[in-house]
């Protein structure tokens, strides 16, 4: 059975069949014996009771108020009342876009990752028995699909699949033809699965420095949005007033990952800063990666093989 209309604010497009179904419908035994009333209020009118005589477009069934079709002047507040149960909806009927097969304000957006399963199925359970045929359109061009009851696309997503997909259900009611349109804006994005974060460059770096001068140690990593990059040094971080961690810089890559950079600035280099490990670590749920920097006095450079130097 079709679920009830629980959303209190509803926007619909003029000219389409539409229904409101109250949420106490499961109390079937009560429904039979209890007085039930539907009301509308809008602007000037307060609580006008609705019945099929109010409009040839309105139909009342057990739990449902139907519009054949809904029109702009149906905008307003609707109430269902039964015993001590009341349900209220605010209905906003908007103009149809006559220059397109869909109305932009009535589009459902979906993001699909490339190469992931992508599916569009045209279904409408409430009007199912009245639907003669259904067509699926992409960017307002009809897809020539064989199943004209429930047209379906099932595939692995490609970037070319991006676009507006409109399911149009054609149905007859009291000798008139109606259609109901449901449109999806499909955006195809790069694979967003997590990478194992990695620090760029050699794992051990010897940096030639002069006492009394300043040095900037740059730590760069390719990581996921939620991963962290940080420096570790000395017995206790923050004990040396000459060492400063600069603000982390992040740039998003075209693949949706992040290139992060964090600089450790050491001012007025002293003996205590030499030959100790300054570790930069990137951490994620998948593990950690660390690279180390060692400051070496320029005079001692000759003792270290050239390939381990970072200038």
């Amino acid at each position: 059975a079709e679920s009830c209309t629980s959303r209190p604010h509803i926007t619909v497009v003029e000219g389409e069949p539409f229904y409101l179904k109250h949420c106490s419908c499961s109390l079937a035994h009560e429904i039979e014996t209890t007085t039930k009333s539907w009301y509308k209020s809008s602007g000037s009118q307060e609580h006008v009771e609705l019945n099929p005589r109010s409009s040839s477009r309105i139909a009342l069934h057990d739990c449902v108020l139907e519009f054949w079709p809904v029109e702009l002047n149906d905008t307003g507040s609707y109430f269902f009342q039964m015993k001590n149960y009341t349900q209220k909806w605010k209905l906003n009927v908007i103009r149809r876009n006559k220059h397109s097969c869909f109305t932009e304000r009535q589009v459902t957006s979906k993001i699909v990752e490339v190469k992931k399963f992508f599916q569009i199925t045209c279904e409408n359970s409430y009007y199912q028995t009245l639907v003669n045929s259904t067509s699926l359109y992409k960017n307002c061009k009809k897809l020539l699909l064989e199943n004209n009851k429930n047209p379906t696309i099932k595939k692995n997503a490609e970037f070319e699949d991006q676009g507006y997909y409109s399911c149009v259900h054609f149905l007859h009611h009291n000798g008139k033809l109606f259609n109901i349109t449901k449109t999806f804006n499909i955006t195809i994005v790069e694979d967003r699965s997590n990478i194992v974060p990695v620090l760029l460059g050699p794992k051990l770096n010897h940096v030639a420095v002069e006492l009394g001068k300043n040095v900037r140690l740059n730590c760069s990593a390719l990581l996921n949005e939620e991963d962290v990059i940080y420096w570790m040094f000395g017995e206790e971080n923050g004990s040396d007033p000459n060492i400063h961690e600069e603000k982390e810089m992040r740039i998003m890559t075209p693949e949706g990952k992040w290139h992060a950079s964090k600089v450790l600035r050491i001012e007025n280099i002293g003996e205590s800063n030499l030959n100790v490990l300054y570790n930069c670590t990137v951490a994620s749920t998948g593990g950690t990666d660390t690279k180390s920097f060692i400051l070496v006095r320029k005079a001692d450079m000759a003792d270290i093989p050239g390939h381990v130097f970072t200038r």
Epitope: K138, N139, E146, N148, K155
Partner: nanobody, 125 residues
Amino acid sequence: EVQLVESGGGLVQPGGSLRLSCAAASGFTLVYSNIGWFRQAPGKAREGVSCISSSGEVAYYAGSVKGRFTISRDNAKNTVYLQMNSLKPEDTAVYYCATLQGDVCTNTFMSGSYRGQGTQVTVSS
């Protein structure tokens, strides 16, 4: 209402080549359709020649054309092609394209709901 339009047919000598195109008419798109090429010669039954899946990854050829005909598609151009090489007089027929019944490109593929008017291919010296 015509949804598919074939072109590229004509008169060709035996051993010659032709390239047939099957395009969607204005307001339609072939992008998710499995498409087949069929042919019918005067006084003969309709025959399935070749078909291609919507992705272009699955193709099938009837035994009589295998190795001579190649089916391909360009979804950006909304067109399916049938490249016909080493043509023989027995290839003479009206060729038309159609969506596939059952949505499958296999050795039993059959014409579906949407089809074109056809294009004449005549192989004669």
